[in-house]
């Protein structure tokens, strides 16, 4: 999203991206910030009691294509959104749980914000 008065020239994404992390902080993270060559993510999952659990962190560039799309999970709900446009961009991601289907969560799109 561009704010008024912002340049329309694409801003190159940082080579090393810093992301907020919660529940997915690697051992070397400081102040709930992790670093990656890939993407920041925020994820929502439904636990066994039906409560939503929101977590966030870093994803490496390798394999982020399939991480950032909603791969089906049997009998449970999970949704993930990814971003790269600036440091800590995942603070502004708010994925929502997919609707309950007849049985399982079906295929979803790739979520890049």
């Amino acid at each position: 999203k561009k704010e008024d008065g912002e340049s329309t020239a694409p801003t190159p994404r940082p080579k090393i991206l810093r992301c907020k992390c919660h529940h997915h902080c690697p051992e070397d993270s400081v102040n709930n910030i992790c670093s990656t060559d890939g993407y920041c993510f925020t994820m929502i999952e439904e636990d066994d009691s039906g409560m939503p659990v929101v977590t966030s962190g870093c994803l490496g560039l390798e394999g982020s294509d399939f991480q950032c799309r909603d791969t089906p999970i049997p009998h449970q709900r999970r949704s993930i959104e990814c971003c790269t446009e600036r440091n800590e961009c995942n603070k502004d991601l708010h994925p929502t749980l997919p609707p309950l289907k007849n049985r399982d969560f079906v295929d979803g799109p790739i979520h890049h914000k």
């Epitope: 997915h24 994820m43 659990v53 490496g60 089906p72 999970i73 049997p74």
Partner: antibody, heavy 124, light 107 residues
């Protein structure tokens, strides 16, 4: 890149226990389920169970509940499987495998990255 | 437990052939079907997940299809490096279970 290192072989006596290790690198260890799989010589694959390193949550195949115990050491990014009361039936190759998807509470069924396997021989 | 059956335990084909390996589940597994390749040295690779999605780095000559209880893995233009044993695995219901494997050999 994702790597799972397992010792090549272990030789143990019947009745004893053994703790097999799987050292992970190249990713955030606490973010993915780790699975363990058994393969007897010339046979198929059997899923033993899975552990989530962050929560320590486990799911076991009922057939292995009294045989295997899964644990992790987050500080060394290592997953362990202890096998108890060993018999010749436990002689097999044991693989650890990291799941495909990042997860916190949901259970995910995709064994995306495999260790080389540890050959366990139970013999007196 | 869900039983996974690979009726063909071994298969002989020529380089360049199109090969199809089948797998049947004892009940509907809602497309939660994965394929693995085990090389003669024991190395195991993840090929296809959720019936038809190719894992990173897997050549496009591999494809998967199926639904309900019947699934298949197809290898187009068979190459020497594809000589291996192929296992299917259901991920719909715990405990996860594997087929018995199909060993692919060169004619």
């Amino acid at each position: 890149q994702v790597q799972l290192q397992q010792p090549g072989a272990e030789l143990v006596k019947p009745g004893a226990s053994v703790k097999l290790s799987c050292k992970a690198s190249g990713y955030t260890f606490i973010s993915y389920w780790m699975h363990w799989v058994k393969q007897r010589p010339g046979q198929g694959l059997e899923w033993i169970g899975m552990i989530h390193p962050n929560s320590g949550s486990t799911n076991y195949n009922e057939s292995f509940k009294s045989k295997a115990t899964l644990t992790v050491d987050k500080s060394s990014s290592t997953a362990y499987m202890q096998l108890s009361s060993l018999t010749s039936e436990d002689s097999a190759v044991y693989y650890c495998a990291r799941d495909l998807l990042i997860a916190t509470v949901v259970v995910t069924p995709y064994f995306a990255y495999w260790g080389q396997g540890t050959i366990l021989t139970v013999s007196s | 437990d869900i039983q996974m059956t690979q009726t063909t335990s071994s298969l002989s084909a020529s380089l360049g052939d199109r090969v199809t390996i089948s797998c049947r589940a004892s009940q509907d597994i809602s497309n939660f079907l994965n394929w693995y390749q085990q090389k003669p040295d024991g190395t195991i690779k993840f090929l296809i997940y959720y019936t038809s999605r190719l894992h990173s780095g897997v050549p496009s000559r591999f494809s998967g299809s199926g639904s309900g209880t019947d699934y298949s893995l197809t290898i187009r233009n068979l190459e020497q490096e594809d000589i291996a044993t192929y296992f299917c695995q259901q991920g719909n219901t715990l405990p996860y279970t594997f087929g018995g494997g199909t060993k692919l050999e060169i004619k």
